[in-house]
């Protein structure tokens, strides 16, 4: 996260009576793993599974379609980012069962952590794309009729990726690897030495805008979308806003945790005690950042379940169905006829 | 009690190489590293690197890396140092010291002088 | 590699003086393991490098209580509440957390 953040036991002592609390011989130190990091290990095992297949499912239903269908071309950029970043998880997975070993060189470290926060930006970025595309299609539908399309679309995710590349540079960065010198052992981290202005001002960077600011847009955003669509009955059904809702809201919910240890870190004298409390979270906290990167398969799925009847359907038809439909206009009002045309709002982080 | 005992001073021509040894006992020796360091007349300390008898590991700081050769003899608890293609700069106490954590014991030191 | 910056590089001191020896590392300190391998060592004429203060701030067996060492993260200082005669010579800080062990261009505690 923010600090070099693993953890193995301490020296203990001397085996000499004469020096006490010193160190021990190299081979006498712990081999146990904290419980933050077997639960977050379990997190990345299933995070991994589900996300690769799921994500892929979702790639592959959407790739055809999104040459001509607008929701397709959303959904497909959002998959392709969780998918980048469960990539990253064989190897992040290894290091913590190695107590946070980084035995792939300096490269692998700036990029394989790095590509979380990619992830982070560019689903968060891709969520205020798509809430917009909402938003206009609720508000604006006379203007969505002469100018929505594939090539805009595509456009917007663009300028979507390039921010999120030009936010995570940074992070990128600052990432070195360190060795320590005993227990031998090479780790992967943020490094910026005495620089902590610059260190607070990554992390605020950060929480303001891959957190706070779309907080704030996208609560505005669909709180207008809502009170619009309930007083004209304008959805097929609240269900579809219930779920985009929850989309949303479990962006927010899994990088909560990630983010507020990040910005109480940067602020933080690394050798304090709540520094190595918050210290020792954090790979949890990351793992749990990262159920964003298999979470919005999941929310396709239940949607499509929900709307299409159980199973009734195969699963790539399911997900076709719940993805690719799009949104139709009518008149001065617009509805959506797309169950999850909205869910497509996630991130994931690393 | 720990004692570290160094070899004798060298003189040695530019060029050339020098073996000095480190005596270890009081202590298990194959469960600390052996470090070696550095002190040029008048200067600072240096780290040249360790060597771990346990699993045969040597790790050496980059400055000297083809410059010293760490070994060490189980059988008799000691360990070797190893300088090649010696140059004037490498005129210098070397120190033997027992690693794994903070240098608590130290040999008395190896003098080398490289002179034409 | 680690840079460790000692200041003064000469320190006159008059016999019962407190002495004060600053150390700042070019990057944090802190280990994994949660601890600071931050250590000091004196250095007399003619002798071998002696472990004072282990871990920031831990004497090592046979120090007198005289000496006392703080700091933490970057920043270490090393106090000689009442300087006496045994205790001039050159003062070391070195860190052990990464590797390449470093160590300060020391402090030369001498007479005034």
């Known amino acids: 996260m923010n600090s070099f953040n693993y953890t193995t036991p301490d020296y203990g002592h001397y085996d000499d009576k004469d020096t006490l609390d010193l160190n021990t011989p190299v081979d006498k130190t712990s081999n146990t793993l904290r419980v933050p990091d077997i639960l977050a290990l379990v997190i990345f095992a299933v995070v991994f599974l589900v996300g690769v297949l799921g994500n892929a499912l979702v790639v592959w239903v959407t790739a055809f379609e999104a040459k001509r269908t607008i929701n397709a071309i959303w959904f497909l950029n959002l998959a392709v980012a969780d998918f980048l970043s469960c990539l990253a998880l064989p190897i992040l997975f290894t290091s913590i069962v190695q107590h946070h070993h980084w035995p792939f060189g300096g490269a692998a470290c700036s990029i394989l952590p790095s590509l979380i926060l990619l992830n982070m930006y560019a689903s968060i970025l891709l969520l205020a794309t798509i809430s917009a595309d909402r938003f206009l299609l609720v508000f604006k539908p006379i203007w969505c009729q002469n100018f929505r399309g594939a090539g805009l679309a595509w456009i917007a995710c663009a300028v979507a990726w390039g921010l999120a590349l030009l936010l995570t540079i940074p992070s990128f960065l600052y990432r070195v690897v360190r060795e320590e010198y005993f227990p031998p052992k090479v780790l992967c981290g943020v490094d910026y030495s005495h620089d902590k202005r610059r260190e607070r001002a990554v992390a605020i960077v950060r929480l303001v805008l891959g957190f706070l600011w779309p907080l704030l847009t996208l609560t505005i955003c669909y709180t207008f979308i809502l009170l619009r669509t309930w007083s004209r009955r304008a959805t097929r059904s609240t269900k579809t806003l219930k779920v985009v809702v929850a989309v949303v809201a479990s962006f927010f919910i899994f990088w909560l945790p990630y983010q507020v240890t990040g910005i109480m870190m940067s602020f933080l004298e690394p050798s304090s005690p709540t520094f190595l409390l918050l210290n020792k979270l954090d790979s949890l906290c990351v793992s749990f950042a990262y159920i964003n990167c298999c979470i919005n398969p999941i929310i396709y799925v239940v949607a499509g379940q929900g709307f299409q009847g159980r199973l009734r359907k195969s699963l790539p038809s399911l997900l076709r169905n719940v993805l690719t439909e799009e949104s139709v206009v009518r008149e001065s009002k617009s509805f959506t006829r797309s169950t999850v045309d909205t869910m497509a709002q996630k991130t994931q982080a690393v | 009690q720990v004692q570290l005992q160094q070899s004798g001073p060298e003189l040695v021509k530019p060029g050339d190489s020098v073996k000095m040894s480190c005596k270890a006992s009081?202590?298990?020796?194959?469960?600390?590293?052996m470090d070696w360091v550095k002190q040029s007349h008048g200067k600072s300390l240096e780290w040249i690197g360790y060597?771990?008898?346990?699993?045969?590991?040597?790790k050496y700081n980059q400055k000297f890396k083809g410059k010293a050769a760490l070994t060490v003899d189980k059988s008799s608890t000691t360990a070797y140092m190893e300088l090649h293609s010696l140059t004037f700069e490498d005129s210098a106490v070397y120190y033997c010291?027992?690693?794994?954590?903070?240098?608590?014991?130290w040999g008395q030191g190896t003098l080398v002088t490289v002179s034409a | 590699d680690v840079v460790m910056t000692q200041t003064p590089l000469s320190l006159p001191v008059s016999l019962g003086d407190q002495a004060s020896i600053s150390c700042r590392s070019s990057q944090s300190l802190v280990h994994s393991s949660e601890n600071t391998y931050l250590h000091w060592y004196v250095q007399k004429p003619g002798q071998s490098p002696k472990l004072l203060i282990y871990?920031?701030?831990n004497r090592f067996s046979g120090v007198p209580d005289r000496f006392s060492g703080s700091g933490s993260g970057t920043d270490f200082t090393l106090k000689i509440s009442r300087v006496e005669a045994e205790d001039l010579g050159v003062y070391f800080c070195?860190?052990?957390?990464?590797?390449?062990?470093?160590f300060g261009a020391g402090t030369k505690l001498e007479l005034k």
């Open positions: 010291t027992r690693g794994s954590g903070p240098f608590a014991y």
């Open positions: 871990k920031v701030s």
């Open positions: 009081g202590y298990t020796f194959t469960d600390y590293y």
């Open positions: 070195s860190q052990s957390t990464l590797v390449p062990v470093t």
């Open positions: 060597f771990y008898p346990n699993n045969g590991g040597a």
